[in-house]
Structures are given as C-alpha cells and as structure tokens.
C-alpha cells in the first residue's frame, strides 16, 4: 500500500501578486479526519494556525487566510491575502498536517520558490527525492542552465539507487520549489496525557480493543516509519519534511464512523468525539 504522504504546494496568483494559495493533499488509503494549515513552522512547533478543516464539520480560518476549502476528499486549498507591500508570504514556510485513520498524523511544509512564476505551478506528483547534497550543487542556476531535460535525467538515475534518509538542513529555506513533498514520521505516542503536545503521532490501526472511557489499547510494536521524504517532479529541492510536531496524537471514540472501525469509534484528538478538533466553518 505504501507510506502515506502529504504534499504542499504554494503558488502566487498570476492576477494578484499579493495573493497566495496553499494547496495540500494527502496520499494514503486512510480516512481524513482533520487538516491543519499553519505558517512559520509546523503546528505546535512555532507555527501559527491559519486554518483547520474537518471533512464534515466545516472549516475555520484566521487572518491572513481568506478562503479555506476542500478541493477533493483528500486535498484542500487555502487562499491568503497579503496586505503588506513587502510580500512576507514569499519567504514563509507553510505546513499542512493531516490527521487520518488509521495512519495517524502526517505533516509536510513548503514555501514559495524564490523565483517562481506566478500561476504556473502544477499539482505535484510524488517521485523519489534527490539527495540533498546533489540538490544543493545543482541549485537554481543548475535548473535554469540544464532545464527540465537534465532534471528528468537526474530523477531517472535516482530511481535506480536507494533513497537516503535526509536530515533537516539549515539550507531548507533554499528550496527551489513550492511543491515540498515530505511524509511526516510516525511513531508510538504515550497514553499518559492525551492533550500533551508530542513530537510523534500514532493512530491505532485496530480500535476494537478501545476501552469504554475512550482510550485505545496501543499495540506493543512501534508504528512504521517512512523511509524517506519524497520530492516533487518540478525542480530539485532540499527536504523540508523531516520535522513534525503533532498535538493530541491519539484518535479514538465517538461520533463519526470511518471505515473499518467499530461502532462509536472515530478519530478525534481528545479521544471523545468531534469536540476535539480545533474549530470549524467555511469561507468568509
């Protein structure tokens, strides 16, 4: 089935240079229970929430978000209005966190490329990532010099060797594309405090052993870990998705009934029903 992935694409509107749109999507078999979009970093790790979208309850958004909406059942868009003349969005990291069943929470971040042509970004396609040192060598000049043909050659060559795990790099801000692909790491969460901010996420795959008070019995094995972030096909990037902060990483009990769960079991961060997701309602 493969590891779930979250993609993030940031684009400047061709008509209004002060308008940006963040597109996020989830690639995985699970049922999405919540999407959180933040800027300045991951949600709960220095980032500031811009919008929260629930597939049934609606969406919530806060300035400078202008319109948050579901584009498909597994992707969302968030339009942003940049009131400042200096266009701060251009240098900002946007992160999308998808809570899904049974995979847990997955988060990726991306930003507008330094020299992006407005309105030209195409929805990304997941492919194996380029090695960070290779991407750094190529850089923007490499992209301009050798063009798409050389990129395709690199990607083709990359497919024939194992993908290394990429560590977060101080040069992450030099990403050359708005389409940052990076599945977040998932591992087992502690049961001690269901409301604590934790650095990992685990959603029990089998909730049939959930306790009456809403706790789920966690399996003893650790959750699978993704073997490496993936990059978009458009231009070489440096991985920016190896970091993740997940709040309320346990999902059980009540209300919505995603596929393959027993009656009364669902995906809500406070383990007690739809109450535990941060805000709702749609566009202003």
């Amino acid at each position: 089935a493969g590891t779930p992935e979250v993609w993030v694409q940031v684009q400047m509107e061709a008509t209004e240079l002060s308008s940006f749109t963040v597109h996020c999507g989830f690639l995985g078999p699970g049922s999405i229970s919540l999407v959180t979009v933040s800027w300045g970093g991951p949600d709960g790790a220095g980032g500031t929430k811009l919008a929260v979208l629930h597939p049934e309850l609606g969406t919530r958004q806060w300035a400078p978000a202008r319109q948050a909406r579901w584009e498909t059942q597994s992707s969302i868009s968030l339009a942003l209005e940049d009131s400042g003349a200096s266009s701060p969005f251009a240098n900002t990291t946007f992160c999308c966190k998808f809570a899904s069943f049974p995979e847990g929470s997955w988060e990726s971040c991306g930003s507008l490329p330094p020299s992006s042509d407005p309105g030209l970004s195409a929805p990304p396609t997941p492919v194996p990532i380029l090695r960070a040192d290779l991407a750094g060598i190529l850089g923007l000049s490499g992209v301009l010099l050798f063009g798409c043909g050389y990129l395709l050659h690199l990607l083709r060559r990359q497919k024939h060797r194992p993908t290394p795990r990429l560590q977060p790099s101080h040069t992450n801000s030099q990403a050359l594309t708005a389409q940052a692909w990076a599945p977040s790491q998932a591992s087992q969460a502690a049961l001690h405090d269901p409301y604590a901010t934790i650095n990992t996420s685990f959603c029990p795959a089998t909730l049939d052993t959930a306790h009456p008070n809403g706790w789920a019995s966690l399996p003893t094995h650790a959750a699978h870990q993704p073997q490496g972030p993936a990059a978009s096909a458009s231009t070489p990037i440096l991985a920016r998705g190896s970091f993740v902060s997940v709040e309320n990483g346990l999902y059980t009990q009540a209300g919505e009934r995603p596929p393959h769960t027993g009656p009364g079991l669902t995906l809500f961060p406070d383990c007690r029903g739809p109450r535990a997701l941060e805000g709702r309602f749609g566009v202003r």
Epitope: G44, T48, K49, H54, P55, E56, L57, G58, R60, Q61, W62, A63, R69, W70, E71, T72, Q73, Y195, T197, E247, N248, P269, D270, G273, P274, R275, A276, L277, E278, G279, R280, F281, G282, V283, R284
Partner: antibody, heavy 114, light 113 residues
Amino acid sequence: EVQLVQSGAEVKKPGSSVKVSCKASGGTFSSFSIEWVRQAPGQGLEWIGEILPGSNSTNYNEKFKGKATFTADTSTNTAYMELSSLRSEDTAVYYCSSYWFAYWGQGTLVTVSS
Amino acid sequence: DIVMTQSPDSLAVSLGERATINCKSSQSLLNSGNQKNYLAWYQQKPGQPPKLLIYGASTRESGVPDRFSGSGSGTDFTLTISSLQAEDVAVYYCQNAHSYPPTFGQGTKLEIK
C-alpha cells in the same frame, strides 16, 4: 472531558462594560477556538465571534464589532469577552462554546438595567 | 450572511409519533469539492445550553439516540425524530456550518400533543 465554566450573572447600568469569563479544562486550551454566542430572552442563538487562544487570532460577527472584545489567558486556560457601551438590548444569556459547538458553558446572564 | 429559516415555528406531536422539522438555507451548504453538506442541528431544553445532535447534515453526535436523524442536501434539510419521547421536548435549531459567520435558524419549539 472538556468542561467550560463561565462566570456568574451580572447586572449592569447602561453605558457600562462587563467582562464575562470562560474557564476551560480537560483539553488543550491553546489549540481550539472558543466561540461566544448570545441568546436574548425568548430568542434564538447568535454567533458573536471566536478567539483562538494560542495565537489570539479572532473572528467577529460584523454585528458585534466594536461591541465585543475577546481575550484569552493561556496560563489560566480562560477566555474572556468584554461587552462595552451596554444597552438594554444587550440583556441576554452569553455562552462560550468550543469544538464545533459540541461543548458549551452553562451561560452567563447579563442584565442591563437602569 | 447565510439566512437559515426553519419550519414550522412550533410543533406538537403525540408520544411515539414521528416529528419532522425543516430547515432552508439562503445559499447552498454543499461543498462541491468533497460533496459534504455543512449543516448542524442542536437541541436546547429550558435553562440549558444547546446540545449538538447532528453535524454534516446527517452524522449523529456521540451519545445521541438513533431516533434522531438528519437528511437533506444543498439548501433543504430535515431533522426527524422517529418516535417522540417525553425528553425530546425542546427547541431545535439548525445551523450553517459552511460560511462565516455561522448562523442559526430561528428555532422550532417541539411539544407533546
């Protein structure tokens, strides 16, 4: 389970202000919106607005801009709504709510009377 | 703002009988992207805050008896109580959960005949 406990009833003079509090427990206070809803005697429900305590981001119903001001104190898990320039028509029960209006405070009756 | 209009304003139904409350929105509450309707139903008993019954037009909140059901799409929605119980006497509100600001219907008072 998340609980929202509001401050007690208030009787105020026209032109004065009142600050209603809403203390949350049992959840991550800074991660979810606190909504404020008004219900005048014998009337329906009106959304006043919301605050996201972690960032103090707010959304206001246009009707209540200038009338209501939201603040939040994450150290005490308490959200506040201040109503200014009170008039008799502001007499109502004011509710705080959260998590898609699934959790509600017990309500605070604010009576404006000379 | 989206205007929510409920009908009837009041309703008297015999115990064990079916009660139906309608709600009409001035704009569609259907999101075309994921084909979900953003409408919620609440029950409010005297002296109590409202209680969430239904969200997403048809999904019952945890702990809500299965005699309560929601249906509809777009601009027309219905709350049905299949077999009225004495404890169901209350005022029922529908609510737009699609667009800011969230707006409520004027309420329908349900009584026992």
